[in-house]
């Protein structure tokens, strides 16, 4: 049976080092990588393997590596961000935008710069809702619809249809009826006066309460590791 080679060892022609090993170009040998949370304190030689040491506070390595120094964790999250992953020895801090904000400038993991979601003013409704990485797109309310709110979530809603119109609706105001009840109202039990800003149409998607935790889909997918950590030996 073939002997198991213990690091460091000289690789055969045409072969590469095994998983969790790297080829050290100085020693010309296959040597052990350091585990996540560690870095190479002493590089291998022909006769001694890599010596690994733990990352210091506020530094990390996410992959098996042979970097001489751990990577620095990113700076603390700003006031418009929430920390969705803490800085540990094995992972960088990840900051994502808090509700009502979107990422205007992303980085490999998380967000570098958050910006508040655009609010559509009265007469305009949300054409495309904001996402983690894109702003709200507003559009003017088409004839027969209105929005009387300044909101990053409200869409244009149809005017109520009156038997007798007291005040015609426009893009920023619902129609006002003179009859005791309109032929059709979009919100059951709605008063027949222009609705206050706080009133929501049932067609509008409810926004999460501030206490709602972001779902896993809110987190950006993990990007590739920094090149310094990448393996070239396997």
């Amino acid at each position: 049976p073939a002997q198991v080679a213990f690091t460091p060892y000289a690789p055969e022609p045409g072969s590469t080092c095994r998983l969790r090993e790297y080829y050290d170009q100085t020693a010309q040998m296959c040597c052990s990588k350091c585990s996540p949370g560690q870095h190479a304190a002493v590089f291998c030689t022909k006769t001694s393997d890599t010596v690994c040491d733990s990352c210091e506070d506020s530094t990390y390595t996410q992959l098996w590596n042979w970097v001489p120094e751990c990577l620095s964790c990113g700076s603390r999250c700003s006031s418009d961000q929430v920390e969705t992953q803490a800085c540990t020895r094995e992972q960088n801090r990840i900051c994502t935008c808090r509700p009502g904000w979107y990422c205007a400038l992303s980085k490999q993991e998380g967000c570098r710069l958050c910006a508040p979601l655009r609010k559509c003013r009265p007469g305009f409704g949300v054409a495309r809702p904001g996402t983690e990485t894109s702003d709200v797109v507003c559009k003017p309310c088409a004839p027969g619809t209105f929005s009387n709110t300044t909101s990053s979530t409200d869409i244009c809603r149809p005017h109520q249809i009156c038997n007798v119109v007291a005040i015609p609706g426009n893009a920023s105001m619902d129609a006002v009826c003179t009859s005791t009840s309109p032929t059709r109202s979009m919100a059951p039990g709605a008063v027949h006066l222009p609705q206050p800003v706080s009133t929501r149409s049932q067609h509008t998607q409810p926004t999460p309460e501030p206490s709602t935790a972001p779902s896993t889909s809110f987190l950006l997918p993990m990007g590739p590791s920094p090149p310094a950590e990448g393996s070239t030996g396997d």
Epitope: P8, Q25, T26, Q28, K46, T47, T232
Partner: antibody, heavy 115, light 111 residues
């Protein structure tokens, strides 16, 4: 298969500069270092040093410090040897050789320095 | 630096006979259970071809007529039987430590 293909012969005058290329194929370029070896007519083989293809850090043998420079174009899997201020004694064939304790060699580049 | 002394400088052997080339190092080239001594062939006007790596390992595609032996400071390349195509200069090289060093070469001719 592993191949190292070097640039063609060069005829230079003393004081000029020459840059020799060595293009690697058949393996991951950044895994193995690249050595350079000089073979002068009627003389032995001299190891000039090597360059770490992962970090780009060169190491020069004592006799080749100063006028000699190793460099890389990693995206093209190519290593370079540049010799500045050429002298007559630089007339030789220069070989690139993959640094994997044993060596795979380029075909060599003859540099002739003559007034 | 490790000095490699190769002998003989030239060698004339009849076809079908054995050729033996020696390489002596000024200090041991052994580390981690390996001897970092290698043998190359250079034909006239050509580059180097790896024959034997780490003292005794035959490189892929090299005929079994070539063999290597030795450890620490004394190494041997043997060609048996010699063929006409083997006319070349043979070099030993150590890579146990930098700088890499080479023997002075042995020129093999046919008698």
């Amino acid at each position: 298969q592993i191949q190292l293909v070097q640039s063609g012969p060069e005829l230079k005058k003393p004081g000029e500069t020459v840059k020799i290329s060595c293009k690697a194929s058949g393996y991951t370029f950044t895994t193995f270092g690249m050595s350079w070896v000089k073979q002068a007519p009627g003389k032995g083989l001299k190891w000039m040093g090597w360059i770490n293809t992962y970090s780009g850090v060169p190491t020069y043998a004592d006799d080749f410090k100063g006028r000699f420079a190793f460099s890389l174009e990693t995206s093209a899997s190519t290593a370079y040897l540049q010799i500045n201020n050429l002298k007559n004694e630089d007339t030789a064939t220069y070989f690139c050789a993959r640094r994997s304790n044993f060596a795979y060699w380029g075909q060599g580049t003859l540099v002739t320095v003559s007034a | 630096d490790i000095v490699l002394t190769q002998s003989p400088a030239s060698l004339a052997v009849s076809l079908g006979q054995r050729a033996t080339i020696s390489c002596r190092a000024s200090e041991s080239v052994d580390s981690s259970g390996n001897s970092f001594m290698h043998w190359y062939q250079q034909k006239a006007g050509q580059s180097f071809k790896l024959l034997i790596y780490r003292a005794s390992n035959l490189e892929s595609g090299i005929p079994a007529r070539f063999s290597g032996s030795g450890s620490r400071t004394d190494f041997t390349l043997t060609i048996n039987p010699v063929e006409a195509d083997d006319v070349a200069t043979y070099y030993c090289q150590q890579s146990n430590e930098d700088p890499w060093t080479f023997g002075g070469g042995t020129k093999l001719e046919i008698k």
